[in-house]
Interface confidence: low
């Protein structure tokens, strides 16, 4: 499927709007600290050149890959030596290295002021001044903050502000229509880019074939009616889908995304019963609906696994064989019966099987040695249990905001080196994990709550790998992909750790923390308790609970007070010396 | 058919440097972790070090860190080992191995071996 032109094919294939939204996103994506206005610049061009290759694919520059073109127009940027310091070494290098050495200097924690959201009257009119550029900025304030945010879906997202405003510009009250809708956007936003830096991360720490185990073993749960040979074809598609926007070919990827929902909607029937009301929306609404349909149901009549993976005396044939063929076979037989596993644990029993065959299959007895694999697979299946059994208990008898004060606690005290806003930010959406999956009925508790928590401890490892500080962080994040939530639940209190010294300028509070939404609030005191902590790692719970009750209360207090910067003052003085007595700092 | 050719082994004096290369054929080389491992004359096999897919993770067996490296390029379906401070215990049979760990998580899984190539360290 030669083109002669890839910008013309690609333009004709997206149509022009997404083929402009994708260009900026990719733009923002790689250069993240230039202004809007230069960014739209560099689009308007690249839009007006593709143009001239849709006339004309024969014409002069158009038979270049898209990574020459794209490169060479981000190297035409006049500050990127004094913006982006050695990022502007990339522009001496030659395609792919150019591409490569750009994805290499992207920012996963880039230091960008904090978007503020204005007031709602500013932000419907400045929507119905100039709506294009409204959306662009959208677009450009995401992709530069989340670089490797899912663009097909970020569009989709875009798609959704667009109809906010639409909506409730127009309505009689105006706040009350827009600002749920714009946190419920911030909180999806927030959670798909976290799921997209997962991808990215296991593709290039682990490479292609992990990922495609990870999908073998997710799609086989979501589509178990489906054959191996299907579920296969779909997995090599999504790799590749996934691979291309990790890898900045956002056109290609949005392209063959588009081409993979048609796929699944055309053959549905071999697939799966849940897709028909996805199938039937507009393309970015179906490509998101098909990402998140619910599990199929399992056929009734399947039988059991251990006919042919441990009964069967061809075992060890059929693995030297074709190992990754079987393997995958494995994956997909035991994950199609298992929804109630997490994708993780699917991918610690398949490791655990071939582990078992590759020294089996060497033994004098294969057989005799294989024979009781499934025996090693129930302590495997009964950690994250436990686990989630335990920490749903004390989720329900502490609620979401002492919970994650006690996950700040419990993780403060395994990594105290790694930064306070980072644990915060960390320990913050980990205890989100409870709210969103405990209310689940068990059958669902696990799939949602360990691949969840995969997914924001790959946080912890990316905002850690820009700065290392831990080697037991380092460890638990590199040395598997499956492993690394177990890896985190098995550190103890890290007893190598100097304490801080106290610093009374940490614990001195103002009266702006009385301005601030509940949130923002607890923020504020979730970073007090981390760095109590990280100067007393040796508190007990009931320490900490009473300094933190003594905290909650002084700022009550000082809220309340005619002269509140005076009683911060004052009343913090006391706190601190009160804190520092009960925690012997 | 999967293929691994050693090539670059030879004879070299204690102190000396030598590079090893590894051209291999008949599968994806970039979805593949891959290692080097040595026999000694009359001893068993030992792991000397690996590279993952991409080249992001590496890993040296003690008794040669510091003085060998190990790299591979993937648009040339190659990999090599570049040995410098040679002594006469780095003396061995020099094998290329591909490591078909499906999750290439925990231990490595060495599905195919070169023929391999034979470094002599000797004054």
């Known amino acids: 499927d030669a083109h002669k032109s890839e910008v013309a094919h690609r333009f004709k294939d997206l149509g022009e709007e997404n083929f402009k939204a994708l260009v900026l996103i990719a733009f923002a994506q790689y250069l993240q600290q230039c202004p809007f206005e230069d960014h739209v610049k560099l689009v308007n061009e690249v839009t007006e050149f593709a143009k001239t290759c849709v006339a004309d694919e024969s014409a002069e520059n158009c038979d270049k890959s898209l990574h020459t073109l794209f490169g060479d127009k981000l190297c035409t940027v006049a500050t990127l030596r004094e913006t982006y310091g050695e990022m502007a070494d990339c522009c001496a290098k030659q395609e792919p290295e150019r591409n490569e050495c750009f994805l290499q200097h992207k920012d996963d924690n880039p230091n960008l002021p904090r978007l503020v959201r204005p007031e709602v009257d500013v932000m419907c009119t400045a929507f119905h001044d100039n709506e294009e550029t409204f959306l662009k900025k959208y677009l450009y304030e995401i992709a530069r903050r989340h670089p490797y945010f899912y663009a097909p879906e970020l569009l989709f997202f875009a798609k959704r502000y667009k109809a906010a405003f639409t909506e409730c510009c127009q309505a009689a009250d105006k706040a009350a229509c827009l600002l749920p809708k714009l946190d419920e956007l911030r909180d999806e936003g927030k959670a798909s880019s976290a799921k997209q830096g997962l991808k990215c991360a296991s593709l290039q720490k682990f490479g292609e074939r992990a990922f495609k185990a990870w999908a073998v073993a997710r799609l086989s749960q979501r589509f178990p009616k489906a054959e191996f040979a299907e579920v296969s074809k779909l997995v090599t598609d999504l790799t590749k889908v996934h691979t291309e926007c990790c890898h900045g070919d956002l056109l290609e990827c949005a392209d063959d995304r588009a081409d993979l929902a048609k796929y699944i909607c055309e053959n549905q029937d071999s697939i799966s019963s849940k897709l028909k009301e996805c199938c039937e929306k507009p393309l970015l609404e179906k490509s998101h609906c098909i990402a998140e349909v619910e599990n199929d149901e399992m056929p009734a009549d399947l039988p059991s696994l251990a006919a042919d993976f441990v009964g069967s005396k061809d075992v060890c044939k059929n693995y030297a064989e074709a190992k990754d063929v079987f393997l995958g076979m494995f994956l997909y037989e035991y994950a199609r019966r298992h929804p109630d596993y997490s994708v993780v644990l699917l991918l610690r029993l398949a490791k655990t099987y071939e582990t078992t065959l590759e020294k089996c299959c060497a033994a004098a007895d294969p057989h005799e040695c294989y024979a009781k694999v499934f025996d090693e697979f129930k302590p495997l299946v009964e950690e994250p249990q436990n686990l989630i059994k335990q920490n749903c208990e004390l989720f329900e008898q502490l609620g979401e905001y002492k919970f994650q004060n006690a996950l700040l606690v419990r993780y403060t005290k395994k990594v105290p080196q790694v930064s306070t806003p980072t644990l915060v930010e960390v320990s913050r959406n980990l205890g989100k994990v409870g709210s969103k999956c405990c209310k689940h009925p068990e059958a669902k508790r696990m799939p949602c709550a360990e691949d969840c928590l995969s997914v924001f401890l790959n946080q912890l490892c990316v905002l850690h790998e820009k700065t290392p500080v831990s080697d037991r962080v380092t460890k638990c994040c590199t040395e598997s992909l499956v492993n690394g939530r177990p890896c985190f639940s098995a550190l103890e209190v890290d007893e190598t750790y100097v304490p801080k010294e106290f610093n009374a300028e940490t614990f001195t509070f103002h009266a702006d923390i009385c301005t601030l939404s509940e949130k923002e609030r607890q923020i504020k005191k979730q970073t007090a308790l981390v760095e109590l902590v990280k100067h007393k790692p040796k508190a007990t719970k009931e320490q900490l609970k009473a300094v933190m009750d003594d905290f909650a209360a002084f700022v009550e207090k000082c809220c309340k007070a005619d002269d509140k910067e005076t009683c911060f003052a004052e009343e913090g003085k006391k706190l601190v010396a009160a804190s520092q007595a009960a925690l012997g700092l | 058919e999967v293929q691994l050719v050693e090539s670059g082994g030879g004879l070299v004096q204690p102190g000396r440097s030598l590079r090893l290369s590894c051209a291999a054929s008949?599968?994806?080389?970039?979805?593949?972790?891959m290692h080097w491992v040595r026999q000694a004359p009359g001893k068993g096999l030992e792991w000397v070090s690996g590279?993952?897919?991409?080249?992001?993770?590496?890993t040296y067996a003690d008794s040669v860190k510091g003085r060998f490296t190990i790299s591979r390029d993937n648009a040339k379906n190659s990999l090599y080992l570049q040995m410098n401070s040679l002594r006469a215990e780095d003396t061995a049979l020099y094998y290329c191995?591909?490591?078909?760990?499906?999750?290439?998580?925990?231990?490595?899984?060495?599905?195919?071996w070169g023929q391999g190539t034979l470094v002599t360290v000797s004054s």
């Open positions: 191995v591909r490591d078909s760990s499906l999750f290439i998580v925990g231990a490595p899984t060495f599905d195919h």
């Open positions: 008949g599968f994806t080389f970039h979805h593949y972790a």
């Open positions: 590279i993952s897919w991409n080249g992001n993770k590496i």
